[in-house]
């Protein structure tokens, strides 16, 4: 497997306490947002998930910086890639979504980052 | 000052029903997720169930999935979970607890005793 | 259902320091386990410690930090006083539920 380690801000929320409560609903459907953004991204072949999904408050705290990691079969895709196919898809983000997605930053994970199972 | 008063505990059967209660006080309850964890007697600390702010999302241990349910009313900052099915091994002091931060504030538990 | 491990007992020192661990079954311990501790004392209602790694709860002493610590989460306490001597839990989030530890039983020698 590869791995990919993603980062990126959306603009147009507001980060709160609620987001560093995995229990709660802001967390449970931002998390559900993104998940199936990523699988629309990505549906093409050799995506296998994403994991260790974590939130934080943007500049200012007043965006929400997202950090994960994306798992995809080995040798299907590279960085460039990843982030190519990401940034392409920040219009439909928007539109689908309601995200505003800025700064996105994709960098390789080096085998194995942990053993913690792909969600 | 934070309050979390639980109720309803006592000596049921196997395969009996309670239900416990959670009163908050202190706080603004409608904006913490909520939980309840347990204690056996002489035990660590087990989990048991947790529920949103608003009770859209509900989660359960796999030891208490399909007999437990986490309710919540707002209205009333009240928290409850209703046991169903009940065995033995749920024998403990039951807590609520809010979340955040560590679980930070807890009740002074309600025991909960199945033997026939 | 993942298991979550900690020390049983540990000793420390008034003064001293000590670092308390939890692991995870499923691997390493990361930020999106929202590592939590909570402290236990006779006599005394549960106290939340630590929440989402490392956020002190409020009134929490400046003595108690949560980090992560060669693949686990950690509760290191300096400045050991005799009123820390305490049982201490550590609980893990995945995915959809939290998981408790055993707990560790922490001895400050008198």
């Known amino acids: 497997m590869s791995f990919f380690f993603l980062s990126f801000h959306i603009s147009n929320l507001q980060f709160n306490s609620s987001l560093e409560d995995p229990s709660t609903d802001y967390y449970q459907e931002l998390q559900r947002d993104i998940s199936e953004m990523f699988l629309q991204i990505y549906k093409q072949g050799g995506f296998l998930g994403l994991s260790n999904i974590k939130f934080r408050p943007g500049g200012g705290g007043g965006s929400v910086v997202v950090q994960l990691t994306l798992a995809f079969r080995e040798g299907t895709i590279n960085v460039h890639d990843v982030e190519t196919q990401f940034n392409q898809y920040k219009t439909e983000a928007a539109s689908r979504y309601n995200l505003t997605i800025s700064d996105v930053s994709v960098s390789d994970v080096p085998f194995p980052f942990s053993a913690q199972s792909v969600d | 000052e934070v309050q979390l008063l639980e109720s309803g505990g006592g000596l049921v059967q196997p395969g009996g029903s309670l239900r416990l209660s959670c009163a908050a006080s202190g706080f603004t309850f409608r904006v913490y997720a909520m939980s309840w964890v347990r204690q056996a007697p002489g035990k660590g600390l087990e989990w048991v169930s947790g529920?949103?702010?608003?009770?859209?999302?509900?989660y359960y241990a796999d030891s208490v999935k399909g007999r437990f349910t986490i309710s919540r009313d707002n209205s009333k900052n009240t928290l409850y979970l209703q046991m169903n099915s009940l065995r033995a091994e749920d024998t403990a002091v039951y807590y609520c607890?809010?979340?955040?931060?560590?679980?930070?504030?807890w009740g002074q538990g309600t025991l909960v005793t199945v033997s026939s | 259902q993942a298991v979550v491990t900690q020390e049983p007992s540990l000793t420390v020192s008034p003064g001293g320091t000590v670092t308390l661990t939890c692991g995870s079954s499923?691997?390493?311990?990361?930020?999106?386990?929202?590592a939590n501790w909570v402290q236990e004392k006779p006599g005394q209602a549960f106290r939340g410690l630590i929440g989402?790694?490392?956020k002190r709860a409020p009134g929490t002493p400046a003595r108690f930090s949560g980090s992560l610590l060669g693949g686990k989460a950690a509760l290191t306490l300096s400045g050991a006083q005799p009123e820390d001597e305490a049982e201490y839990y550590c609980a893990l989030w995945y995915s959809n539920l939290w998981v408790f530890g055993g707990g560790t039983k922490l001895t400050v020698l008198r």
């Open positions: 607890a809010r979340y955040p931060y560590g679980f930070d504030y």
């Open positions: 499923t691997g390493a311990v990361t930020t999106s386990n929202y």
């Open positions: 989402g790694t490392n």
């Open positions: 529920i949103s702010e608003t009770g859209s999302y509900t």
